[in-house]
């Protein structure tokens, strides 16, 4: 067991052109805080994957207000170290993500708001117990300078915190087979501690926390005899001797439980009993709890009242992500119906409705003709969110109140002359044309191409259009 420690030295503009604008202003004072996420091995996992080695949040830094016109300086930092305790051996190689968050303190609706300013990641080799390692990482125009180390918690020592030390029982030397503990020369290496419950008769260990079985015994704690008894021999690691029945690999072989979780076989699979502060199928998720305030932007932390249980964040509308850290464009969900215009005001969504629609989401189709009278014998027709009057002959306009000039649209073709008439319009056709709108040519032989002129009307006579 031990602690990974991270010391942030500075966060500010990196070298070169394009210095970033200060994240704070007189109108929006802000302060910084940091989050570190550790994963074992040299994994290139997504930022959202579990921080299997652990995670930590810093305190909030001092409030900072930009001086107008001044370039962004190094920003004031929170006091103290970020500490990530680890329960198991230190893996030696690890991946890290360090996030710089900005807490805006302006008088915006909703009180403080959080936004991610920068995220750096890297993969490193590090021995526990060594000196501080210094690092510089850049994210866009920002630069983060920091140091880190892993240190073992007594009684563990060594580059992986797997060796245990105890005070000497005798002043001069350590017990048989046990070496002094450098650099603590006045202490001695302690015997290995096998996995809890490992059978003292049938199991042994070469690394702390493991349980390897003597031949003829199996199970996670070496308590299950192999059924063919002729194979039993008093010593030696388990092996598949000819004629012996050695069971196939069990679900707990290799201990799938991370972070010091203990594995127990179930009829179908395995079950991990996780230490305090970890959860998940394999104890892979570190125990950030609701008390750590993990929900940003007004999110409510549900569950996770103690380190043994997970938490979830219920995010206010407009935010999402496991910590409510991502702002959502709520208008992208197209909440306004019937062609309404969406406005995300931050504190609320508003829909500006097209004519003929109403309601918070423009969901109500107004009865366009309700209370609408079309004058002069016109009839009301609903459609497209607006009423329309179909007017009687001789009338026009939105409500059929205007007397129409039936000749305004030049309805008579081929040079015919239009006359307004009480029942509509009349076209006086030019020579050679006939029809209600003078649309048909008269053939030279006197036969018309299309319907014959009605009785009593000669070609060329004015035609009344009914």
């Amino acid at each position: 067991a031990g602690v990974f420690e991270l010391q942030i030295h500075s966060f500010g503009p990196g070298p070169g052109p394009g210095a970033p604008r200060s994240p704070c202003s007189a109108r929006l004072p802000c302060r910084l805080f940091f989050r570190v996420c550790l994963k074992p091995g040299l994994s290139e996992e997504a930022a959202e994957s579990p921080c299997a080695l652990g995670a930590a949040l810093s305190a909030r830094g001092p409030v900072y207000t930009e001086q107008p016109g001044a370039p962004a300086p190094d920003l004031p930092l929170p006091d103290g170290l970020l500490q990530v305790p680890f329960r198991d051996a230190w893996p030696g190689t690890f991946s890290f993500i360090i996030e710089t968050w900005r807490e805006e303190l302006g008088d915006q609706i909703g009180g403080p708001a959080w936004s991610l300013l920068a995220r750096v990641a890297g993969r490193r080799r590090l021995a526990a117990g060594g000196p501080w390692a210094r690092d510089i990482q850049r994210a866009g125009a920002w630069e983060l300078r920091f140091s880190y180390r892993a240190r073992c918690e007594p009684p563990a020592v060594g580059t992986a915190c797997t060796r245990l030390c105890r005070p000497r029982s005798a002043p001069s030397r350590c017990g048989p087979g046990l070496r002094p503990c450098a650099p603590l020369e006045d202490e001695c290496e302690a015997p290995l501690v096998c996995r809890a419950g490992c059978s003292p008769e049938h199991g042994f260990c070469e690394q702390p926390g493991e349980c390897r079985c003597l031949e003829g015994w199996t199970g996670p704690l070496c308590t299950v005899p192999v059924s063919t008894s002729s194979c039993l021999s008093p010593r030696g690691p388990s092996s598949a001797t000819t004629g012996c029945l050695v069971p196939g690999p069990g679900p707990c072989d290799g201990n799938p439980c991370a972070n010091g979780g203990s594995c127990s076989e179930t009829p179908r699979s395995f079950e991990c009993t996780c230490p305090r502060g970890f959860y998940g199928l394999r104890c892979e998720v570190s125990g950030v709890t609701c008390a750590d305030g993990p929900c940003f932007n007004g999110g409510l932390c549900v569950g996770g009242a103690d380190p043994d249980s997970a938490y979830i964040c219920h995010c206010p509308p407009g935010f999402q992500g496991s910590n409510c850290e991502k702002r959502v464009d709520r208008c992208s969900l197209q909440p306004c119906r019937n062609g309404g215009l969406c406005l995300d005001l931050g504190h609320a969504l508003r829909c500006r409705c097209r004519a003929g629609f109403a309601g918070p989401r423009c969901e109500h189709d107004l009865d366009d003709c309700a209370g609408r009278a079309c004058a002069n014998g016109g009839t009301c027709v609903e459609g497209g969110g607006a009423h329309r009057c179909s007017c009687a002959l001789g009338f026009g306009g939105r409500d059929c109140r205007e007397r129409a000039d039936p000749c305004a649209a030049r309805p008579c073709a081929h040079g015919g002359r239009c006359y307004a008439h009480f029942s509509g319009l009349v076209c006086a056709c030019a020579p050679g044309y006939m029809g209600a709108r003078c649309e048909f040519p008269v053939h030279p032989d006197g036969a018309s191409a299309l319907p014959a002129a009605p009785p009593g009307l000669r070609p060329g006579d004015p035609q009344r259009y009914l």
């Epitope: 807490e103 609706i109 909703g110 009180g111 403080p112 609701c290 008390a291 750590d292 305030g293 929900c295 940003f296 007004g298 999110g299 409510l300 932390c301 549900v302 569950g303 009242a305 219920h314 206010p316 509308p317 407009g318 909440p335 931050g346 504190h347 609320a348 969504l349 309601g359 918070p360 989401r361």
Partner: antibody, heavy 118, light 108 residues
């Protein structure tokens, strides 16, 4: 301005189920979380439950086994059911809108008194 | 759950005086997720302050909030006649949402 109106019986017999509905006007129920809070006569406020149109809900652990909350977006309403009531459930029941800035209550109904008595 | 303890239970003051109401949490309220409400007799509560110190729309500037962690304060700089009512605090950082027991401000 959003308006919330509680409705439901003012008198419920012990061991029966209390049912209340909150009708929301001038706002879309899909834009906010909605909650129920109660206040026994002469006492303080107690949060009961909240719901979002998507179905996300949360309950006060002290009442969870007896409470259910539901939402009807088509009617712009949400409802509360509290089963196996006793005299201790006598209270003014408020429906309220939860702010988009956090889980506090920025608009309240005027409240409805529910008395549990035989 | 986070328990909120308001003190005093009753505050006796005269109009024009300054009122200081306290709300103490049993554990830290993350990110100052604390609100204050005012409740007049026979009415629903009304939001005054959220985020520990931000005034809600339409709230007179004689009301102000402060504090962080476990200790929060509502201050009424000059008590108006209509301010002699009951005040509640509420935390909204960790479920379940919880209210304080209330402080009654009465005329001396």
């Amino acid at each position: 301005q959003v308006q919330l109106q509680e409705s439901g019986p003012g008198l419920v017999k012990p061991s029966e189920t209390l049912s209340l509905t909150c009708t929301v006007s001038s706002d879309s129920i899909s834009s906010y979380y909605w909650s129920w809070i109660r206040q026994p006569p002469g006492k303080g406020l107690e949060w009961i439950s909240y719901i979002y149109y998507s179905g996300i809900s949360n309950y006060n652990p002290s009442l969870k086994s007896r409470v259910s909350i539901s939402v009807d977006t088509s009617k712009n309403q949400f409802s509360l059911r509290l089963s196996s009531v006793t005299a201790a459930d006598t209270a003014v029941y408020y429906c309220a809108r939860i702010s988009v800035a956090g889980f506090f209550f920025d608009n309240w109904g005027q409240g409805t008194l529910v008395t549990v008595s035989s | 759950e986070i328990m909120l303890t308001q003190s005093p239970d009753t505050l006796s003051l005269s109009p024009g005086e300054r009122a200081t109401l306290s709300c103490r949490a049993s554990q830290s309220v993350s990110s100052s997720y604390l609100a204050w409400y005012q409740q007049k007799p026979g009415q629903a509560p009304r939001l005054l302050i959220y985020g520990a110190s931000s005034r809600a729309a339409g709230v007179p500037d004689r009301f102000s909030g402060s504090g962080s962690g476990t200790d929060f304060t509502l201050t009424i700089s000059r008590l108006a006649p209509e301010d002699f009512v009951v005040y509640y605090c509420q935390q909204y950082g960790i479920s379940p949402l919880t209210f304080g027991g209330g402080t009654k401000v009465e005329i001396k």
